[in-house]
Interface confidence: medium
Amino acid sequence: CKAMHVAQPAVVLASSRGIASFVCEYASPGKATEVRVTVLRQADSQVTEVCAATYMMGNELTFLDDSICTGTSSGNQVNLTIQGLRAMDTGLYICKVELMYPPPYYLGIGNGTQIYVIDPEPCPDSDF
């Protein structure tokens, strides 16, 4: 297993609609044709898998239908969007990239993006 550098922003603020987007960029040491991207969330002593997608270079990322993630790829970077976030989902979101094929296998784990989610204030009753 060979190490690979993965870069991602340190902090992202989710929109009022609970959507957060960030770029995950990896320094590909070889000519990978198949790449796997996993988003992990670390909170306290727990690491949970948020979503994962495997894609062929040049093609779109395909997450599972019920996934809260969507994404697009361009060269050695992946634009990830996580939807449906609430304040309780605030945490460190880590991008894990695996170059699956052809060999050799490379693994890279980013330092994480701290996503802050603020629940919107309920709108007061209005006559307007």
């Epitope: 002593s45 898998e49 695996e98 784990i109």
Partner: antibody, heavy 118, light 107 residues
Framework: EVQLVESGGGLVQPGGSLRLSCAAS????????MSWVRQAPGKGLEWVSA????????YYADSVKGRFTISRDNSKNTLYLQMNSLRAEDTAVYYC???????????WGQGTLVTVSS | DIQMTQSPSSLSASVGDRVTITCRAS??????LGWYQQKPGKAPKRLIY???SLQSGVPPRFSGSGSGTEFTLTISSLQPEDFATYYC?????????FGGGTKVEIK
């Protein structure tokens, strides 16, 4: 309360097959990677295999690669280990563990004994 | 593959003693190391994660330190229930590898 309960162990002849199961409860199973770890009688711990939460990524120890297959059914909260071409050296207690990746294993099952002997 | 060399393989100590167990990784693993306690016939139990973080519910007499290639588990004052076998585990990269174990026995 997190619970992991292994089953499916038993006596099998060399060259035979066995499928182990690990029923999980008390946590959102699909959010977590899972691993199998084994321990031969009187020996130390040996990691066997791991699978990511969504089941997309699988990993194996060299000693079982090509013979064992890890899988999971998230709708049933169950982890599996299909073991083929079993050898005497596969005799061990097999544990499933909730895998927090670089933070290690926070919960383990009680183990199930697999004995490979003629 | 990353090899984990654990020492000593066994030790005899008395209640109240300070006990130190060492694990050395064959290559740098950041702080991606845990310590596990196992008693006969039982599943292992995590004591320390991320080299130095104490698992919830584990007594504070257990502590871990180290980063890179050298790691230490310390029991500050050995208690009767601490007589067991201890393993380190690197979870930096696959295949995951355990140390050979340290059996702590009563002197």
């Amino acid at each position: 309360e997190v619970q992991l309960v292994e089953s499916g162990g038993g006596l099998v002849q060399p060259g035979g097959s066995l499928r182990l199961s690990c029923a999980a409860s008390g946590f959102t199973f699909s959010n977590y990677a899972m691993s199998w770890v084994r321990q031969a009688p009187g020996k130390g711990l040996e990691w066997v295999s791991a699978i990511s939460g969504g089941g997309l990524s699988t990993y194996y120890a060299d000693s079982v690669k090509g013979r064992f297959t890890i899988s999971r059914d998230n709708s049933k909260n169950t982890l599996y280990l299909q073991m083929n071409s079993l050898r005497a050296e596969d005799t061990a207690v097999y544990y499933c563990a909730k895998d927090l990746l670089w933070l290690g294993f926070d919960y383990w099952g009680q183990g199930t004994l697999v004995t490979v002997s003629s | 593959d990353i090899q984990m060399t654990q020492s000593p393989s066994s030790l005899s100590a008395s209640v109240g003693d300070r006990v130190t167990i060492t694990c050395r990784a064959s290559q740098a693993i950041r702080n991606d190391l845990g310590w596990y306690q196992q008693k006969p016939g039982k599943a292992p139990k995590r004591l320390i994660y991320a080299a130095s973080s104490l698992q919830s519910g584990v007594p504070p007499r257990f502590s871990g330190s180290g980063s890179g290639t050298e790691f230490t588990l310390t029991i500050s004052s050995l208690q009767p229930e601490d007589f067991a076998t201890y393993y380190c585990l690197q979870h930096n990269s696959y295949p995951l590898t355990f140390g050979g174990g340290t059996k702590v026995e009563i002197k």
